[in-house]
């Protein structure tokens, strides 16, 4: 417990002190006081440096004194023989004696008292930054006007913090500028602008004078700018050492000015303003920015348009442009969106054709459609080559995005017909010689396939059966063979409007307009045994001349059989109509004069007994195309005749081309278009 005063006596005092003694006293007075220690008696064996016996006075780690020998007062009015004054409130006194004393020594008597210390003057380190005030037992610090005492109760500073600047433009200076700034202060200024504006600080070199750095380069007084996680500075010295224009990229800036106790200069002055936050002109490949500017700032909006062949894909929807806004954080909105090559996707399949897989389906890639040759060809031109266009479509130079159409090649038999062994006015034939040949089983008759959906035949074949069963692709019409061939199902029968319907068809003498069309329910797939015959052109090239040769085919009556099981064919010439008129009608059902002959009929045959007969009706009279010798067209349809084995009459198809085309057009399904 600290005391204000006390007495310290050597052991046995005032008797002689014993040998080999070591004793210590710890003196403590209250905080804020020093100690005055004084000796009134001192009688200790004398030795050099007091090595044998001594009294030692220690303050902290410092030896204040070491005493031995005898002392007497120099002042008759004072008993004090030795004294110590320490400005600390603790002191240690240590007494030591060695093993022998040649004489009898009485030791010492000492007293201590607490004394006031002047903290303001007694120490090397001044306790107060500005004014120090001593009092008994302590001191207090005080400050000049406009300064305040910090919480440590020792340091004074100016009240220069807490200012918040929100205006878009402003000026800030150190306290007292241009007079010296206060020492020992920390000034904090805050600039807080609206989001989307960055603080830009501008200084002039001559507006800055702050105590220079020490030899290690550390600023003793410093100015620091803090913007988010970025720091500019610390700055110090004569003349501003940093950039004169500081773009902080932030709407919030803290300015911190820290000074120490010494070396005040005039300080600093700065200006700031709010710049709309810039957004970088980003490199967005394959696109153009509108408007194009050297610098983009907060709230600027640009339209980013992809170059042709590129698109921006957002949520799996393709667009050619998007908008981006310069945001308050200096970043562009929609920055994840990119212009990427257009993907045209898997090319569409086409009927009776194919498209090879492209290496790529991206913009600029090329695909080629081909038709299933030799049975189909590309009707609508364009060559079949398509490229992936900028709009995401596969596009052809001629057709645009329209797909190619593979239509059957007409009039080309896989194997040409050759007259072999003579069989009563005709030859055996193979269906590959006449792939257009259609077999009707009720009535037993023929027809000609003219495209995927249509069969041409004679009106008299279908007038009695509007739902005929037809077959294609078989040379033999044996039931077992027909089961393996392709059966065609009719959707509708169209008989020429000029065909006169009779109550008793058996007595017919007028076969004018003996032509009909059968629309099929499903398209026919073409191949070596099934392929259409061409229709005649409308030009005069397709007008038949006497002697022109044509081919007929069918499973009709032969000399030996009423019906043929295997396909028969013959080559016959066109004859003048009068030749047919001159032949006497076999088993006439009316007067010979009643039989009607019109320009819609072709007369053919008469050579070597080759002729069509009952059961061949509706089959084609196929003539080589005058403009393309590789093809055959249906010049006629087996219609009627005065007598088998002579001349026969055939419906002149050329006269009905318009009706055929119109009927097919009006009754086609969209899928066939």
């Amino acid at each position: 417990e600290p005391t204000m005063y006390g007495e310290i006596l050597s052991p046995n005092y005032p008797q002689a002190y014993p040998s080999e003694v070591e004793k210590s006293w710890d003196i403590e007075v209250p905080e804020g006081y020093g100690i005055h220690l004084y000796f009134t008696h001192l009688d200790i064996e004398l030795s050099e440096n007091c090595a044998y016996d001594s009294v030692q006075i220690i303050s902290g780690d410092t030896e204040e004194g070491r005493l031995c020998g005898q002392r007497s007062s120099n002042n008759p009015h004072s008993p004090i023989v030795e004294e110590f004054q320490v400005p600390y409130n603790k002191l240690q006194v240590i007494f030591k004696s060695d093993f022998s004393n040649e004489e009898r020594f009485t030791g010492f008597a000492a007293y201590y008292v607490a004394t006031d210390i002047n903290e303001c003057t007694d120490f090397v380190d001044v306790p107060c930054s500005h004014f120090c005030n001593n009092f008994i037992g302590g001191y207090f610090c005080s400050c000049p006007p406009e300064y305040f005492l910090h919480d440590d109760m020792k340091n004074c500073g100016v009240n220069c913090s807490g200012d918040v600047f929100t205006a878009l433009i402003g000026e800030i200076a150190s306290p007292n500028y241009p007079k010296p700034y206060p020492e020992n202060s920390r000034c904090e200024y805050q600039i807080r602008l609206e989001k989307g504006f960055q603080v830009v600080v501008t200084l002039r070199r001559e507006d800055f004078d702050v105590e220079a750095a020490d030899s290690a380069g550390n600023c003793l007084d410093s100015l620091v700018f803090v913007a988010g996680d970025r720091q500019f500075g610390p700055y110090c010295g004569h003349g501003f050492p940093g950039p004169l224009n500081i773009e902080t990229k932030s709407n919030a800036l803290d300015i911190i000015f820290q000074t120490d106790l010494t070396g005040q200069k005039k300080g600093w002055k700065l200006r700031y303003h709010g710049d709309p936050m810039p957004c970088p002109k980003e490199d967005t490949p394959n696109s153009v920015w509108e408007p194009a500017k050297a610098k983009y700032v907060f709230r600027d909006v640009v339209q980013i348009t992809c170059l042709d062949g590129f698109e921006v894909v957002e949520g799996r929807v393709g667009a050619t442009s998007f908008y981006s806004t310069c945001q308050s954080n200096g970043k562009w909105s929609n920055s994840k969106l990119k212009c990427q090559p257009v993907d045209c996707g898997i090319p569409e399949s086409i009927e009776n054709g194919k498209v090879e897989d492209p290496e790529s389906t991206l913009f600029g890639s090329v695909i080629r459609y081909t038709c299933e040759e030799p049975y189909y060809y590309m009707e609508n031109g364009g060559g079949g080559e398509y490229h992936c266009a900028g709009n995401g479509s596969w596009v052809n130079e001629v057709l645009g995005p329209e797909l190619p159409k593979c239509v059957p090649v007409c009039g080309v038999p896989r194997e040409p017909f050759e007259e072999k062994q003579r069989i009563i006015g005709g030859s055996d034939a193979d269906i590959k010689n006449f792939p257009w040949q259609v077999f009707f089983d009720n009535p037993w008759a023929g027809g000609a396939l003219i495209n995927e959906y249509w069969v041409l035949t004679a009106a008299h074949v279908v007038e009695g059966n509007r739902e005929p069963t037809m077959y294609v692709g078989s040379t033999s019409v044996q039931t077992s063979r027909l089961a393996k061939s392709k059966m065609l199902t009719p959707e509708h029968v169209f008989i020429h409007p000029g065909w006169k319907l009779l109550e008793v068809p058996e007595g017919r003498t007028n076969f004018d307009n003996d032509i009909a069309l059968v629309r099929l329910k499903d398209p026919v797939k073409m191949g070596p045994t099934v392929s259409p015959i061409c229709l005649p052109g409308t030009s005069s090239d397709y007008n038949l001349m006497d002697g022109d040769l044509g081919l007929i085919s069918g499973w009709g009556r032969t000399e030996k059989r009423d019906r043929a099981v295997r396909l028969k064919a013959a080559r016959l010439p066109v004859a003048p109509l009068r030749k047919c008129k001159e032949v006497k009608v076999e088993k006439p059902t009316a007067d010979a004069e009643a039989y009607v002959f019109t320009p819609n009929m072709i007369c053919a045959g008469g050579e070597k007994g080759m002729d069509s007969c009952k059961g061949d009706s509706g089959g084609a009279f196929a003539v080589q195309d005058p403009n393309d010798k590789t093809k055959f067209y249906a010049a006629g349809l087996v219609s009627w005749g005065p007598q088998c084995g002579t001349y026969g009459l055939y419906t002149r198809v050329k006269n009905y081309v318009d009706w055929i085309m119109k009927t097919m057009q009006e009754n086609s399904t969209p899928r066939e278009d």
Epitope: R316, I346, E348, S349, E351, K354, D357, P670
Partner: antibody
Framework: EVMLVESGGGLVKPGGSLRLSCAAS????????MSWVRQAPGKGLEWVAT????????YYLDSVKGRFTISRDNSKDTLYLQMNSLRAEDTALYYC???????????WGQGTLVTVSS | QIVLTQSPATLSLSPGERATLSCTAS???????LHWYQQKPGKAPKLWIY???NLASGVPSRFSGSGSGTDYTLTISSLQPEDFATYYC??????????FGQGTKLEIK
């Protein structure tokens, strides 16, 4: 006549695998892009995957990407769907379909049932 | 992805009546790539109308399709007993995925 016949369906535990096949006939298989479409019991149709005619381009429904693989063998006129890491929500009748003009599916098989259950 | 919404979910009509089925896309669809399918219970779907208005092979002429952009319609001029089924619309978009509507069930009243 165009025909598509699926096979390979069955009962499988979650996390298991199945391989579906679709045998095509009656048309030139290598000329057509093909798709798999599924129908959960009592629900609507959901497209699963598409493959181009030559097999070099494939597209998948997001939820099956990385788990299912569509492939084809044009020499065998067969379409496949390899299904790995199956989940309960993959339970459905799986149809294969031929793609026609406009990527319409003009011919469908009768379907094969896949049940994923523990 | 493009979402197709069919309405109504169920349509109850009598034979001989006119039926109008609607399909609305969440964003514009090319008319070339909008198709309709008919499905009867226990059977596979059948292509019914393709590219908005083209009838598939064998589909009776009482059926018709129309529309553009986001709104498409399948119409049956005079319902026949065999027309009662579920109809799905379907769109293809090159960026995928291909999507179907949830279906409209056409039932006999």
């Amino acid at each position: 006549e165009v025909m598509l016949v699926e096979s390979g369906g069955g009962l499988v535990k979650p996390g298991g695998s199945l391989r579906l096949s679709c045998a095509a006939s009656g048309f030139t298989f290598s000329n057509y892009a093909m798709s798999w479409v599924r129908q959960a019991p009592g629900k609507g149709l959901e497209w699963v995957a598409t493959i181009s005619s030559g097999g070099s381009h494939t597209y998948y429904l997001d939820s099956v990407k990385g788990r299912f693989t569509i492939s084809r063998d044009n020499s065998k006129d067969t379409l496949y769907l390899q299904m790995n890491s199956l989940r309960a929500e993959d339970t459905a009748l799986y149809y294969c379909a031929r793609l026609f003009t406009g990527h319409a599916m003009d011919y469908w098989g009768q379907g094969t049932l896949v049940t994923v259950s523990s | 992805q493009i979402v197709l919404t069919q309405s109504p979910a169920t349509l109850s009509l009598s034979p001989g009546e006119r039926a109008t089925l609607s399909c609305t896309a969440s964003s514009s669809v090319s008319s070339s790539y909008l198709h309709w399918y008919q499905q009867k219970p226990g059977k596979a779907p059948k292509l019914w109308i393709y590219s908005t208005s083209n009838l598939a092979s064998g589909v009776p002429s009482r059926f018709s399709g129309s529309g553009s952009g986001t709104d498409y319609t399948l119409t049956i001029s005079s319902l026949q007993p065999e027309d009662f089924a579920t109809y799905y619309c379907h769109q293809y978009y090159r960026l995928h995925p291909i999507t179907f509507g949830q279906g409209t069930k056409l039932e006999i009243k």
